[in-house]
C-alpha cells in the first residue's frame, strides 16, 4: 500500500540532489586550495542531517549549525558583493573581478545555488515530488532557512564598504521582502561597515533616468542610515559595458559614465 505523502505547493527536491551536492563540494575544494581540507562526505552528511526525517515546515537555523561549522571559510570582509533579483550579473561580475565574493562564491553558497530540497517527518526519504513553498505553505522550510542562515552570516562578515547590486528593471528595485531586504540589510554590523553602496542596474538601452532617486532606494537609504551606516548609490546604465570595463579598465571608453 503506497504511503500517504504530503503534497506541497512548491517543486520537489532537485533530481540527483545528493550526487549534485557531493560533486559540487568535490569540484569546489579542488578549485579552491584553501578548502582542500574539507571532507565532502562529512559536508553531505551534515547537509542531509539538517532536513532528513524532519518536518519540512519546522526547520530551524540550529539544524544547519553542523553544516555551517564544516563550511567555515573566511571571506575578505571588504570584498563582499550582495545582490537582489539580479544574480546572473552579480556572478558574472565576480567571475571577472576575482577578488570580490558573492555568497554563491563561497563553498556553502555554491553547494546550494539553484537547488531545492526537503525531506519528510519520521522517514529518511528525500521528497522529490514537492517541497513547501515559502508563501503558500510555510517559511521555515529547508531551503528558506538555509539561505536565511548563510545570508545572515555572510552579511555579518562584511566590513568597510559593502556593495549591493539591485535590479533597476523591477517595480520594487529594493524589496523589503527579499533576502537582501529582510535578512542581509539587518545583519550588516554598523561597527564594522562604514558604507553600503548600491549599484542599480538599468535594463533598457535608452533608460537614462536616475534610479537612485527611486522611492524604494530612498527607503533603503533610510533603513541603512538609521543603522548608522552611510549609503551611496550609483546607476549602472550599461551593464554590458560595465562588465567589459571591469575586464579591461584601461579601455579609453571606460572613463565615461557606464
Amino acid at each position: 500500500v503506497p504511503r500517504w505523502r504530503q503534497q506541497w505547493s512548491g517543486p520537489g527536491t532537485t533530481k540527483r540532489f545528493p550526487e549534485t551536492v557531493l560533486a559540487r563540494c568535490v569540484k569546489y575544494t579542488e578549485i579552491h586550495p584553501e578548502m582542500r581540507h574539507v571532507d565532502c562526505q562529512s559536508v553531505w552528511d551534515a547537509f542531509k542531517g539538517a532536513f532528513i526525517s524532519k518536518h519540512p515546515c519546522n526547520i530551524t537555523e540550529e539544524d544547519y549549525q553542523p553544516l555551517m561549522k564544516l563550511g567555515t571559510q573566511t571571506v575578505p570582509c571588504n570584498k563582499i558583493l550582495l545582490w537582489s533579483r539580479i544574480k546572473d550579473l552579480a556572478h558574472q561580475f565576480t567571475q571577472v573581478q576575482r577578488d570580490m565574493f558573492t555568497l554563491e562564491d563561497t563553498l556553502l553558497g555554491y553547494l546550494a545555488d539553484d537547488l531545492t530540497w526537503c525531506g519528510e517527518f519520521n522517514t529518511s526519504k528525500i521528497n522529490y515530488q514537492s517541497c513547501p513553498d515559502w508563501r503558500k505553505d510555510c517559511s521555515n522550510n529547508p531551503v528558506s532557512v538555509f539561505w536565511k542562515t548563510v545570508s545572515r552570516r555572510f552579511a555579518e562578515a562584511a566590513c568597510d564598504v559593502v556593495h549591493v547590486m539591485l535590479n533597476g528593471s523591477r517595480s520594487k528595485i529594493f524589496d523589503k521582502n527579499s533576502t537582501f531586504g529582510s535578512v542581509e540589510v539587518h545583519n550588516l554590523q554598523p561597527e564594522k561597515v562604514q558604507t553600503l553602496e548600491a549599484w542599480v542596474i538599468h535594463g533598457g538601452r535608452e533608460d537614462s533616468r536616475d534610479l537612485c532617486q527611486d522611492p524604494t532606494i530612498k527607503e533603503l537609504e533610510s533603513i541603512i542610515s538609521k543603522r548608522n551606516i552611510q549609503f551611496s548609490c550609483k546607476n549602472i546604465y550599461r551593464p554590458d559595458k560595465f562588465l567589459q570595463c571591469v575586464k579591461n579598465p584601461e579601455d579609453s571608453s571606460c572613463t565615461s559614465e557606464i
Partner: antibody
Framework: QIQLVQSGPGLKKPGESVKISCKAS????????MHWVKQAPGKGLQWMGW????????TYAADFKGRFVFSLEASASTANLQISNLKNEDTATYFC???????????????WGQGTSVTVSS | NIVLTQSPATLSVTPGESVSLSCRAS??????IHWYQQKSNESPRLLIR???QSISGIPSRFSGSGSGTDFTLSINRVESEDFSIYYC?????????FGSGTKLEIK
C-alpha cells in the same frame, strides 16, 4: 563564567614531547574555534594556528607545521597542543584562546587560558 | 601572510598624558583589526575589536580608529595600570597575525 584552564608548566629535555591541555567551560565549546599562541621569553605573541572544534580540523601557521599537533577531546570540552621532538627554541609560554566562528569570519580572541610555560633544557 | 607593523616599539610617557599607538597592515584589511593589552606575566586581554568597537569592562579611555591599512589605539590620559605591552591582531585572513607590540613605559 567563561574559563579556559590550561595544564601546568613542564621542564623537558630536547627530543622529548609535551602535551598541553586547555579545558573550556562556561560556553558551548563547538561555537568557538580554539587558537594557540606562542610567546618566547621577552618576545611578542606568535600565532600558531587553530582547530575547528566541531570538525576537529586543524590549521597551522607556516612556522608550526610538522612537530606541532592540535587535537580535541570534544566530550571533555578540551583542546590539546602536542609538541614532539622538542628543541631549545620551543621554550616559551603557550596560550590557548577562543574565537567565535561566524562561518565566514572570525571574531577576535576574547578569552584566553592562563598560559603554560614549557622549558626545554638539557 | 598579512604583516602588521606596530610603532613605536617603545613609548615613554608620564601618567596623565594621552598617547596614540600605530598599527599598519601590509594590505587593506577593512576593519578586521583587534587590540590587546598584555601585562607582565599575564595573558593578553582584548581591548578593542574591529578597529573601533569597545569591549564591555574596558575603561572608556581606550579607543580605536582606522580602516584599510592604518589603525590607531588611543589612550586618553594614561593611568599607572596602563603601562604594559599592546598588540594588534588581524582576522581578515584565516591565517591570523599579530603585530610585534608596543611597550608603554613610564617616563
Amino acid at each position: 563564567q567563561i574559563q579556559l584552564v590550561q595544564s601546568g608548566p613542564g621542564l623537558k629535555k630536547p627530543g622529548e614531547s609535551v602535551k598541553i591541555s586547555c579545558k573550556a567551560s562556561g560556553y558551548t565549546f563547538t561555537d568557538y574555534s580554539m587558537h594557540w599562541v606562542k610567546q618566547a621569553p621577552g618576545k611578542g605573541l606568535q600565532w600558531m594556528g587553530w582547530i575547528n572544534t566541531y570538525s576537529g580540523k586543524p590549521t597551522y601557521a607556516a612556522d608550526f607545521k610538522g612537530r606541532f599537533v592540535f587535537s580535541l577531546e570534544a566530550s571533555a570540552s578540551t583542546a590539546n597542543l602536542q609538541i614532539s621532538n622538542l628543541k631549545n627554541e620551543d621554550t616559551a609560554t603557550y596560550f590557548c584562546a577562543r574565537c567565535y566562528d561566524g562561518t565566514f569570519y572570525y571574531d577576535p580572541m576574547d578569552a584566553w587560558g592562563q598560559g603554560t610555560s614549557v622549558t626545554v633544557s638539557s | 601572510n598579512i604583516v602588521l607593523t606596530q610603532s613605536p616599539a617603545t613609548l615613554s610617557v608620564t601618567p596623565g598624558e594621552s598617547v596614540s599607538l600605530s598599527c599598519r597592515a601590509s594590505q587593506s584589511i577593512g576593519t578586521s583589526i583587534h587590540w590587546y593589552q598584555q601585562k607582565s606575566n599575564e595573558s593578553p586581554r582584548l581591548l578593542i575589536r574591529y578597529a573601533s568597537q569597545s569591549i564591555s569592562g574596558i575603561p572608556s579611555r581606550f579607543s580605536g580608529s582606522g580602516s584599510g591599512t592604518d589603525f590607531t589605539l588611543s589612550i586618553n590620559r594614561v593611568e599607572s595600570e596602563d603601562f604594559s605591552i599592546y598588540y594588534c591582531q588581524q582576522s581578515y585572513s584565516s591565517l591570523v597575525t599579530f603585530g610585534s607590540g608596543t611597550k608603554l613605559e613610564i617616563k
